[in-house]
């Protein structure tokens, strides 16, 4: 039997400079594309190798992006969120929520769709 799984949630402001190929990550989520049950938030689903986000090193797959340049990402359609990032300019400020899994007891299994990874 697996031990109880807890999560340590932290927030961080990440400032990225758009690189030659952009910001370098993929997102899932939105009011029309719920990735996490009962949560229409925007989550990072992929960090592109050698992209701006990967080179910065702080943004991680599974992070929830709360805002872009101070603009809240709550209640956005998926494509509207994508467009917001694409039009965010050269210097992009992301407010992100990291969700770190803290294992109590035997190691559990983290499945696809879990925002922690």
């Amino acid at each position: 039997m697996n031990g109880r799984v807890d999560y340590l949630v932290t927030e961080e402001e990440i400032n990225l400079t758009r690189g030659p190929s952009g910001l370098g990550f993929n997102i899932v989520g939105g009011t029309d594309q719920q990735y996490v049950s009962n949560d229409s938030g925007i989550y990072v689903s992929r960090i592109k190798e050698n992209g701006a986000a990967a080179l910065d090193g702080r943004l991680q797959e599974g992070d929830k992006i709360l805002s872009v340049n101070g603009q809240d990402l709550k209640n956005l359609l998926h494509q509207d969120a994508v467009d917001l990032f694409r039009n965010a300019g050269y210097a992009v400020s992301l407010r992100v929520q990291h969700r770190l899994q803290v294992q109590n007891g035997p190691i559990g299994h983290r499945g696809e769709g879990d925002p922690s990874g």
């Epitope: 190929s21 952009g22 910001l23 370098g24 990550f25 993929n26 997102i27 899932v28 594309q33 990735y35 990072v44 689903s45 992929r46 592109k48 992209g51 998926h78 494509q79 994508v82 990032f85 694409r86 499945g111 696809e112 769709g113």
Partner: nanobody
Framework: EVQLVESGGGLVQPGGSLRLSCTAS????????MAWFRQAPGKEREFVAA??????YYADSVKGRFTISRDNAKNTMYLQMNSLKPEDTAVYIC?????????????????????WGQGTQVTVSS
């Protein structure tokens, strides 16, 4: 890890039709950006079509003849191929990535995708 399995290939006469399927593992299939590529013997891998949350994309060589679609309930993407030509002969490979890029999307760039199937052979010959 996402697994992709293609099916539906075969031998068809010029002018004929085939429907290819690509079935994917994972409960978040609806979020995947997916594409079809093809590779003929001795040739480079070539983009055919892609489907994202917001739309579809086609190579000029298949526009008006091929249609890409998906059924999220079945975790399956399709490629309906009509008016097939001998030059469509190739191994057809499906590709996927979870989510949408926040950058300019280049559907024909293989680096846009993380997961690849093994392919299904399509031969157009009389």
């Amino acid at each position: 890890e996402v697994q992709l399995v293609e099916s539906g290939g075969g031998l068809v006469q010029p002018g004929g039709s085939l429907r290819l399927s690509c079935t994917a593992s994972g409960r978040t299939f609806s979020t995947y950006t997916m594409a079809w590529f093809r590779q003929a013997p001795g040739k480079e891998r070539e983009f055919v079509a892609a489907i994202t949350w917001s739309g579809t994309y086609y190579a000029d060589s298949v526009k008006g003849r091929f249609t890409i679609s998906r059924d999220n309930a079945k975790n399956t993407m399709y490629l309906q191929m009509n008016s097939l030509k001998p030059e469509d002969t190739a191994v057809y490979i499906c590709a996927a990535v979870i989510g949408s890029t926040v950058d300019s999307y280049s559907p024909s760039d293989p680096l846009e995708y993380d997961y690849w199937g093994q392919g299904t052979q399509v031969t157009v010959s009389s």
